[in-house]
Interface confidence: medium
């Protein structure tokens, strides 16, 4: 079997001229394409993977909402040569674009990472945006998390930051087959610089503080967590669709998740690796286009965020 192969990380890695073909290994009988689009009130981007897969042919579409962060996921598997180029990986431009000035800021201020690489979305590096309320929904919280897409033995992960409706969520997430959008929320100006280590303590309940014994003179030290890299190849074990076993999606790299193997609507994701040479990471961020109102995601159709009406 021969399949198209590409990786798109909020850039143009799966644009027409960058398409590769790859011969699948023995026992690999489907070509896979998966795309996940994420939209914040300040912009949108998509991640996508094409390559050799496993399982049975089928299609799986899903719209997801995480505290006002919208995600749309599509998975398509097929069994003919080079059949995995049916999904539209293009984000349709919102109408009108760049219309944020039409909305009244509600006082909340957050870091925004929309299609930015992990390097450009560290600490206080990313741009700061003013939150606003849209379609009667109040966006006064800030979010720090990741979107992760696993398909064809490749895992693509990008940071997501922006304004959300919740101000206290902790390691919350939504999942589709091989797709996870997860993270934590906070309250206060620019509070979402790094919420990876946020605990489940409510802001109204003071956390338990362990005081050192009176006899100890040495100051207490805090263990520092090193940042985990998420844009790595998936484990080489042949599994089907992955989902966190916990009720809430882990806010860590896919390798740190406890995974269970499930089969969903006839489409599974892993299989022969679709080699890609340097296609991910080029180009820069996706277009920053503002959302003026929120529409529901369609159940079917191209993997693109629907155009929004302006004011």
């Amino acid at each position: 079997l021969e399949c198209y192969s590409c990786v798109q990380k909020a850039d143009d890695g799966c644009s027409p001229h960058r398409m590769k073909t790859v011969k699948c290994g023995p026992g690999v009988d489907v070509c896979t394409e998966a795309v996940g689009a994420v939209e914040t009130i300040h912009g949108q981007f998509s991640v996508a993977v094409r390559g050799c897969g496993s399982g049975i042919p089928g299609k799986n579409d899903r719209g997801l909402d995480l505290h006002g962060l919208l995600a749309f996921f599509q998975l398509q598997q097929c069994s003919e040569d080079r059949c995995n180029a049916k999904l539209n990986l293009t984000l349709r431009g919102l109408n009108p674009a760049g219309n944020e000035s039409a909305y009244e800021p509600n006082g909340a201020e957050c870091y925004s990472c929309v299609g930015l690489s992990r390097e450009k979305c560290q600490g206080s590096m990313p741009p700061v945006v003013n939150c606003y309320n849209a379609s009667g929904r109040v966006y006064k919280g800030c979010f720090d998390g990741n979107v992760t897409l696993t398909a064809a033995n490749v895992t693509v992960s990008l940071p997501v930051r922006g304004c959300v409706q919740d101000e206290t969520c902790t390691r919350d997430g939504v999942t589709g087959p091989g797709f996870t959008l997860s993270g934590s929320c906070c309250q206060g100006p620019r509070c979402n610089a790094d919420l990876r280590n946020k605990t489940y303590f409510s802001p109204r309940i003071p956390p338990l503080v362990l005081l050192p014994p009176p006899t100890t003179a040495a100051p207490s030290t805090r263990a520092q967590n090193s940042s985990s890299t998420t844009s790595t190849a998936a484990p080489t074990t042949t599994t089907s669709i992955i989902k966190p076993t916990t009720a809430q999606a882990s806010h860590t790299s896919p390798h740190e998740m406890d995974l269970e193997v499930i089969q969903e609507e006839g489409a599974s994701l892993s299989g022969g690796a679709a080699g890609h040479g340097g296609t991910a990471g080029h180009g820069g961020a996706a277009g920053h286009q503002d959302r003026s109102n929120m529409e529901k995601y369609p159940g079917k159709g191209g993997a693109q965020i629907p155009a929004k009406g302006g004011s």
């Epitope: 143009d12 644009s15 027409p16 001229h17 398409m19 539209n88 080029h282 180009g283 277009g287 920053h288």
Partner: antibody, heavy 117, light 112 residues
Framework: EVQLLESGGGLVQPGGSLRLSCAAS????????MSWVRQAPGKGLEWVSY????????YYADSVKGRFTISRDNSKNTLYLQMNSLRAEDTAVYYC??????????WGQGTLVTVTS | QSVLTQPPSASGTPGQRVTISCTGS?????????VHWYQQLPGTAPKLLIY???KRPSGVPDRFSGSKSGTSASLAISGLRSEDEADYYC???????????FGGGTKLTVLG
């Protein structure tokens, strides 16, 4: 029917500027990656610049980097190429092309840019 | 000097079969990127002839076929006709240059 119509070419002195336009019709322009490709008289095709559908990702050939700027207006279905600091070697027919099925599937008729003193 | 190498000229008589080669490297054709072929008739804009190594857009006669192997690709024209007289260009993405690249072009002459 897909149509791409270039305009804005002409005669210009070295160091001068020109702005090329490409009016698109017959397809959803805002979903299409677009490129400029040029062809010097009697020579082969040379890719010049590329812009993604949203306009967020842009590439240039080394020969024009820093002098040419590609842009698009999806509301007007128009692609642009702003050419500054023009040189004699920029003399060519400039084509705008749509990227479709992994290739430039539609081309405009071209507009001639002549740089001479 | 083009990144993809094509013979500058080729010729054949009507009815003959002609093949045009396109040689690349490990950063373009050899990296797995698909190859496309364009036909440019005299005084006109280029037209897509073969895409995705061996696929024909609608309207292109099946006399035209493409193939790819390793770091090379080729365009074959069978049952040559006088209207096939044109310049032919191959193209592919190049990983190292991070852009699309063209061959230098092959001028096909139909003799007689």
């Amino acid at each position: 029917e897909v149509q791409l119509l270039e305009s804005g070419g002409g005669l210009v002195q070295p160091g001068g500027s020109l702005r090329l336009s490409c009016a698109a019709s017959g397809f959803t322009f805002s979903n299409a990656w677009m490129s400029w490709v040029r062809q010097a008289p009697g020579k082969g095709l040379e890719w010049v610049s590329y812009i993604s559908s949203s306009g967020s990702t842009i590439y240039y050939a080394d020969s024009v980097k820093g002098r040419f700027t590609i842009s698009r207006d999806n509301s007007k279905n128009t692609l642009y190429l702003q050419m500054n600091s023009l040189r004699a070697e920029d003399t060519a027919v400039y084509y705008c092309a749509r990227e479709g099925l992994w290739a430039f599937d539609y081309w405009g008729q071209g507009t001639l840019v002549t740089v001479t003193s | 000097q083009s990144v993809l190498t094509q013979p500058p000229s080729a010729s054949g008589t009507p009815g003959q079969r002609v093949t045009i080669s396109c040689t690349g490297s490990s950063s373009n054709i050899g990296a797995g990127y698909v190859v496309h072929w364009y036909q440019q008739l005299p005084g006109t804009a280029p037209k897509l002839l073969i895409y995705d190594n061996n696929k024909r857009p609608s309207g292109v006669p099946d006399r035209f076929s493409g193939s790819k192997s390793g770091t090379s690709a080729s365009l074959a024209i069978s049952g040559l006709r006088s209207e096939d007289e044109a310049d032919y260009y191959c193209a592919a993405w190049d990983d190292r240059l991070n852009r699309p690249v063209f061959g230098g072009g092959t001028k096909l002459t139909v003799l007689g």
